[in-house]
């Protein structure tokens, strides 16, 4: 009669939770049989990043430090369950975290977009269109932002017109302006659960242009044009 | 990147046996169980079993229990399946994956032909 | 075992419609299920796992859902490169089983 390792009820073990989930939150348990009937000790190998501690009689599997989506989902431990007495016997499964998103990532700005000019004085109003991302998951759809000016005062001379959930169009009101640099505030909304909203700014230069690019006196860098 | 290399054919004769490979890369190959799965023409996948390569643990389908061998070197990050007294009927595509939830990762498949 | 009834066996939709294929088990599997696409002469490709969890890089427009023994893959606004065959899998306990697929057309 050859004493067996205990056996796992699940080929692997799976849990859904949120991310935001309280310190000392149950996220999880895993379950496994002793052919003898042996009494069984469960522990975690290969918890790298500190996250959970498993109760050893029960196999309940708590959280122990804030966890975090964007590390990287589902994130994977290896269970053991070791007979206790007998042979001491072991067997491995695996015990798969997932972490559902929450909105903690306010939006941002998709690229560097310093460099944006107009060449100086402006025949027509001109415009000049800007993306936005965050770093949350967005499930079965894209983010869809919302764009407004940063500031009331900037009303007189911007406006700001969203194209879809990501892009936007920033248009000048008029023709009538400075020979210098304008930092235009945007405030783009995600429009989640919490809403988060992130004020960005662009830098556009009105500037005198020499074969389509800002003319700078030498020392100057010139800019490129990004409209 | 994750690959999973596999031969893209093996050609046997009734009765005899093959062992096919099936090489990864861009991983850990000792952290990642591994998979192998069987399909014949016009047919759905069936699960032949899986390895742990760091413990060298095989788990069987009862079905090709006296059929497949599931071996890991992992000095050469190769997982191996050997099929024995072989017929027609394991003529088939067999892929080797990675186990994550589900196989995150396949091979490209070897086309094993048994035939005289 | 652990069956996997999937439906329908084949499916044609023209591109920009919404497609649904379901898979029942034979016993409650918990959402241990993902489902797979599978291109002719690729390798199969894992679309969702855990129920309604989409694998990292695979179109917004893929959505499972379902639990207990009725699960549902969904494509919206279908695209020609979606031809391919179909499967779910559960993992909840060996033996793994698969659907026996569907094969899904571009009229």
């Known amino acids: 009669d050859v004493n067996e390792a205990p056996q796992f009820s699940q080929h692997v073990f799976q849990a859904k939770v949120s991310e935001d989930v309280a310190i000392g939150t149950k996220v999880g348990n895993v379950t496994a049989k002793d052919p003898e009937g042996l009494d069984i000790s469960y522990s975690l190998r290969g918890d790298t990043r500190g996250w959970l501690k498993i109760d050893h009689v029960t196999g309940e599997i708590f959280s122990v430090a804030p966890l975090d989506r964007e590390a990287g989902s589902p994130y994977r431990v290896q269970v053991v369950a070791t007979e206790v007495g007998g042979s001491s016997l072991s067997s491995v499964s695996e015990f798969h975290l997932i972490l559902m998103d929450v909105n903690d990532n306010p939006p941002r700005l998709a690229k560097d977009y310093t460099g944006l000019f107009f060449c100086h004085p402006l025949s027509a109003p001109g415009s000049l269109i800007f993306e936005a991302t965050d770093d949350d998951q967005h499930l079965f759809r894209g983010p869809h932002f919302t764009f407004s000016l940063g500031s009331g005062s900037l009303q007189n001379d911007w406006e700001v017109s969203k194209i879809n959930g990501t892009h936007a169009r920033l248009s000048t009101r008029h023709t009538e302006f400075e020979e210098r640099e304008y930092v235009v505030l945007i405030r783009i909304n995600d429009g989640g659960r919490p809403p988060l909203e992130g004020i960005v700014s662009l830098p556009v230069t009105f500037c005198s242009c020499v074969e389509g690019s800002c003319f700078r006196p030498a020392g100057h860098k010139h800019h490129h044009h990004h409209h | 990147q994750v690959q999973l290399q596999q031969p893209g054919a093996e050609l046997a004769k009734p009765g005899a046996s093959v062992k096919m490979s099936c090489k990864a890369s861009?991983?850990?190959?000792?952290?990642?169980?591994m998979h192998w799965m069987k399909q014949r023409p016009g047919q759905g996948q069936e699960w032949i079993g899986y390895i742990n390569p760091s413990t060298d643990y095989t788990e069987y389908n009862q079905k090709f229990k006296d059929k497949a061998t599931l071996t890991a070197d992992k000095s050469s990050s190769t997982a191996y399946m050997q099929l024995s007294s072989l017929t027609s009927e394991d003529s088939a595509v067999y892929y080797c994956a990675r186990s994550r939830l589900g196989f995150d990762y396949w091979g490209q498949g070897t086309t094993l032909t048994v035939s005289s | 075992d652990i069956v996997m009834t999937q439906s329908p066996a084949s499916l044609s939709a023209s591109v920009g419609e919404t497609v649904t294929i379901t898979c029942r088990t034979s016993e409650n599997i918990d959402s241990y299920l993902a489902w797979y696409q599978h291109k002719e002469g690729k390798s199969p490709q894992l679309l969702v796992y855990a129920a309604t969890v989409l694998a990292d890089g695979v179109p917004l427009r893929f959505s499972g859902s379902g639990s207990g023994t009725q699960y549902s893959l969904k494509i919206n606004s279908l695209q020609s490169e979606d031809v391919a065959r179909y499967y779910c899998?559960?993992?909840?306990?060996?033996?793994?089983?698969f659907g026996s697929g569907t094969k899904l057309e571009i009229k």
């Open positions: 899998q559960h993992y909840y306990r060996t033996p793994l089983t």
């Open positions: 861009g991983y850990s190959f000792s952290s990642y169980w």
